[in-house]
Interface confidence: low
Amino acid sequence: EICGPGIDIRNDYQQLKRLENCTVIEGYLHILLISKAEDYRSYRFPKLTVITEYLLLFRVAGLESLGDLFPNLTVIRGWKLFYNYALVIFEMTNLKDIGLYNLRNITRGAIRIEKNADLCYLSTVDWSLILDAVSNNYIVGNKPPKECGDLCPGTMEEKPMCEKTTINNEYNYRCWTTNRCQKMCPSTCGKRACTENNECCHPECLGSCSAPDNDTACVACRHYYYAGVCVPACPPNTYRFEGWRCVDRDFCANILSAESSDSEGFVIHDGECMQECPSGFIRNGSQSMYCIPCEGPCPKVCEEEKKTKTIDSVTSAQMLQGCTIFKGNLLINIRRGNNIASELENFMGLIEVVTGYVKIRHSHALVSLSFLKNLRLILGEEQLEGNYSFYVLDNQNLQQLWDWDHRNLTIKAGKMYFAFNPKLCVSEIYRMEEVTGTKGRQSKGDINTRNNGERASCESDVLHFTSTTTSKNRIIITWHRYRPPDYRDLISFTVYYKEAPFKNVTEYDGQDACGSNSWNMVDVDLPPNKDVEPGILLHGLKPWTQYAVYVKAVTLTMVENDHIRGAKSEILYIRTNASVPSIPLDVLSASNSSSQLIVKWNPPSLPNGNLSYYIVRWQRQPQDGYLYRHNYCSKDKIPIRKYADGTIDIEEVTENPKTEVCGGEKGPCCACPKTEAEKQAEKEEAEYRKVFENFLHNSIFVPRPE
């Protein structure tokens, strides 16, 4: 039975029964978040041979090996990956070995085996026999090999049963567990799989086969499966599907997309049954199953449910990839970013029409608007207050709008507004008036001749904060209503905030001409009632973290010396409240007598406050049967138990720890200090680990059904 489109087993180990009849999982398999240690011995799924996407295991208590669950899992195809990985084993507290002794091929993607405190038999598996490239594998934070004593079958009895290969210049036996060797095919088979009896399979087989040189006896197919046969390509009138099998037109017509919000079903294109037409193609009619090439960029109407689409990062711009008509308003707010112009052009460069308004503000990373290289029409069907359909405010490095010699842009309705663009020449704005047909629509204040193209501003008044309230991840602040001589000239307020461990920040920290700016900025509109004090709720903050905050009033009023009159506050330092700390790290326990345990740990990575105490809980566990599988009396076969670097010695260290010899002299000395390159590499490694862990948590933690 083909199961799919992806199986997620969580919370209750009895859900594993869903795998009972599966031979192929067309999609992914997640087994995760089973916090109660269970006895998995009664669960066995010998029918499962192939997973077409990836296998993810995360926090499954009590599971000691995967070999009993999936004794015949042979191929993980990796057609779709989990963060570049086809096999992820993460924080499996009780897993002692992987044990997938029939796993022969991971077709695409790498493996990530991390933070499995009890996991051994990792150095005994030669992953290069299973994957094409092992350089992207990530195997860290598992049980130190020195503590494992991994022994392949027969080595204790001096009758080794497994074959040897070389990994990292070490020639050694290869096995999955104490009693399961890693299968290797005879060199005569080349890249072909082989049977249990070492006979070569048919070239179209992948992983293994039940009979030699027979394309109907494959456990899995190298290319495609159709009607019981492994074929190099799908036969006529059938189509590739999910990267592994061939299906007919009727099958394709009756599957409906789980990911596509397109109301149509799947399409057939270039011999494949797929969710939607590929880039550069469009359906040949709304009910059609076929794709035709687009003339020029494919017309694609994109609509924003909230009417206004905010582009504040490459990620948000990505949502507009391929769009030619944008129904709604564009608010561009790009403060920083790497290679930002080409990234924005990549994702927004096809937009030809915007039906509403375009507003560009605080986009200090932008030098030009040429990334909107195909924009030819702003309809202005919806306008900002004051009837503006093109609004450009406070863009510190904006120098050019478009190349008007090669640009035709029409603004059908609405006015333009430009203010506080110190590097944008007024002549450039006047040129835009002519090209867009808006000349004569703007009134005097709409194009500010003093603060566009002129680096000259000064704040002369001080804004005073009136109240501050904090919680663990929020700050509420209010400030005095600022009253310039002419109240109508007050446009809005801008609140700047950032993390500030020390009280030494300045307004200009982190700003440069390339658009970098370390301050977060939030616009605050004027309260409708003149007597209400303006304020803001800053949310999504970190607990127990000091922030620096200041506020600017944005006004139009001019003083005698033609400088812009405005107001800003002093920098306020304010700390969020404490919260629950994250879990303590690197918990280690060791026994120093028959009645004592020494437990050590590192503080949590996010204390979220001042830690005052830890709570340690323990309970008696049944004796681990695994300990009895080795003959510990056999001399020299089990390494002496040593603690890995960074773990504890039973006796407190009272002198300098003896480590490697450094320099020319032999004898005890301290570890050499790390080079800058090593420190940088460690920093990047830690960052990469964090990014993966965030991705994992974001992917698998979902709200409980209502």
């Epitope: 029964k17 009756n254 409906l256 997309s257 789980a258 990911e259 919000s261 149509e264 079903g265 969710q275």
Partner: antibody
């Protein structure tokens, strides 16, 4: 032709149980969730629960947890709903209706409905 | 649970007229996959309900183009132009985004 044929009307006593069936034909039974919907006399419709015929996995409206139990028999392409500890509140027409299972998110809807089974609870 | 409120309860109409039925959800019914599973069903006396509109505005196959759906977030509308006798019955809106899935109370379309 795609059809969902439901079992006939049932007259049962309070406190008793009843098991009603829904026979699917004309389509791949395992490609669709089977849902059950209740309609009390003169009232609106209430979604009760659904079952994945592949795995036997179920989703229940909490209101009907303990009241209804869903099962399927793949060999006969039939879905069943057992109602227990019946009271007059359970007197209603019960419909089975299908909902695409695989790749379903763009077309999750009840496109085919059963004929309805009337359950009357009376002493 | 998401409460679906339909208005009006009863809608007297003349044949050939246009009718409009409103449905409001107590919270947004956008599914985590980005789709809004709002459907409209018509139930005629003594019959099972029949699907008219799915995902707010998509007409089910075989449904005349006199039927159209619109809306977003929490407010949705079914419009029927040029009413015919076969359109009479009870119309239900339904949300399939959040478990438990819920129907509106129904709107009875009847001749004036």
């Amino acid at each position: 032709e795609v059809q969902l044929q439901q079992s006939g009307p049932e007259l049962v006593k309070p406190g008793a149980s009843v098991k009603i069936s829904c026979k699917a034909s004309g389509y791949a039974f395992t490609d669709y969730y089977m849902n059950w919907v209740k309609q009390s006399h003169g009232k609106s419709l209430e979604w009760m629960a659904n079952i994945n015929p592949n795995t036997g996995g179920t989703n229940y409206n909490q209101k009907f947890t303990g009241k209804a139990t869903l099962t399927v028999d793949k060999s006969s392409t039939t879905a069943y709903m057992e109602l227990r500890s019946l009271t007059s509140e359970d007197s209603a027409v019960y419909y089975c209706t299908r909902w695409i299972l695989y790749y379903g998110s763009s077309k999750w809807y009840f496109d085919v409905w059963g004929t309805g089974t009337t359950v009357t609870v009376s002493s | 649970d998401v409460l679906m409120t339909q208005t009006p309860l009863s809608l007297p109409v003349s044949l050939g007229d246009q009718a409009s039925i409103s449905c409001r959800s107590s919270q947004t019914i956008v599914h985590s996959n980005g789709n809004t599973y709002l459907e409209w069903y018509l139930q005629k006396p003594g019959q099972s309900p029949k699907l008219l509109i799915y995902r707010v505005s998509y007409r089910f196959s075989g449904v005349p183009d006199r039927f159209s759906g619109s809306g977003s977030g929490t407010d949705f509308t079914l419009k029927i132009s040029r009413l015919e006798a076969e359109d009479l019955g009870i119309y239900y809106c339904f949300q399939g985004s959040h478990v438990p899935y819920t129907f509106g109370g129904g709107t009875k379309l009847e001749i004036k």
